[in-house]
């Protein structure tokens, strides 16, 4: 009777347990009753990090110098390339897929002064009644929404990182 589950590092194909391809390689053909799984090493500039049955390896990340990036760790057939910002440049966000010469103000902080050709961004903490939920080199702290002006009530208080949440007034009074 054909198996319904396979062991670790195997997968079920046409009622057979086939071996997965090891990290650094990709699938070229599934196993048969007569032949094992056929795998092929990833090409240069590509990688696969896990045991897999994928027909394509993944492309290494490109650390584009014109996005302010440089290679921190070169990719291998089993690992992706890791990028970091050029000296003096700053990640535009947590993902750090691009960099800017001027720093961003983190959530909870707003821009007090936008960067100029000679000075970096100046950030300030959002005071009570204001918030910033984004990392930005341009945005000031925004005032909390005024629920009253919308005939609503505060359902959830605001913080320096979040706006208040308004909701309908309780009719049962």
């Amino acid at each position: 009777e054909p198996p319904t589950a396979c062991s670790d590092k195997q997968y079920l194909h046409d009622g057979q347990c086939c071996d997965l391809c090891q990290p650094g390689s990709r699938l070229t053909s599934h196993c048969t009753a007569l032949e094992k799984t056929q795998c092929h090493p990833c090409d240069s500039g590509e990688f696969s990090a896990q045991w897999n049955r994928e027909i394509r390896c993944h492309q290494h990340k490109y650390c584009d110098p014109n996005l302010g990036l440089r290679v921190q760790q070169k990719g291998t057939s089993e690992t992706d390339t890791i990028c970091t910002c050029e000296e003096g440049w700053h990640c535009t966000s947590e993902a750090c897929e691009s960099c800017v010469l001027h720093r961003s103000c983190s959530p909870g902080f707003g821009v007090k002064q936008i960067a100029t050709g000679v000075s970096d961004t100046i950030c300030e903490p959002c005071p009570v009644g204001f918030f910033s939920n984004v990392s930005s080199a341009f945005e000031k702290c925004h005032p909390w929404t005024s629920c009253e002006t919308k005939d609503l009530v505060v359902q959830q208080a605001g913080t320096n990182k979040t706006d208040v949440v308004c909701g309908p007034q309780d009719r049962l009074r």
Partner: antibody, heavy 117, light 106 residues
Amino acid sequence: EVQLQQSGPELVKPGASMKISCKASGYSITGYTMNWVKQSHGKNLEWIGLINTYTGGTTYNQKFKGKATLTVDKSSSTAYMELLSLTSEDSAVYYCAGTGTGAMDYWGQGTSVTVSS
Amino acid sequence: QIVLTQSPAIMSSSPGEKVTMTCSASSSVSYIHWYQQKSGTSPKRWIYDTSKLASGVPARFSGSGSGTSYSLTINSVEAEDAATYYCQQWRTNPYTFGGGTKLEIK
């Protein structure tokens, strides 16, 4: 307020070249990346290339190499894209878009280019 | 190049409904960014780094995903959400966009 103001619509003849400008206001363009994007028939967006406004370094989509040339004038906070040897295939709306938070944060209003004899 | 395939190409929804659109990458990407474009206007950054809402984007929007599969969800759709939404990747040159999902509101 951060804004990107692009030059006006253009009607150009096949074989001609033209230059679109994108002026930043509300911030200094230097140290941010400026992207250029093509939109044909109000449909798909195609990334043309980008310029590092600090170094002047450019990265192009291979498809647009030889078609587009990107430059920047830091003193006027203006980025430019020159389109060469225009054909009807180049008729589209072209956008500049500044990168500041990972994505393309700020977009110009678009410049419509019509190539016709 | 990394091809981003968005589905559906067009979708129709009624106000209050939950809507999900997807963006599938031909090769693994670490993050996806989403843009909203209304007819006759420039695209706007909508969601960046897969799940972070841009400033001014209503909380009914959310983004998620990893690897080759990403999605944008609107919890309770409103008339003002009618637009075309594009996904985009910064992983490898060329930095491609998806073909877009046009959201129509009944």
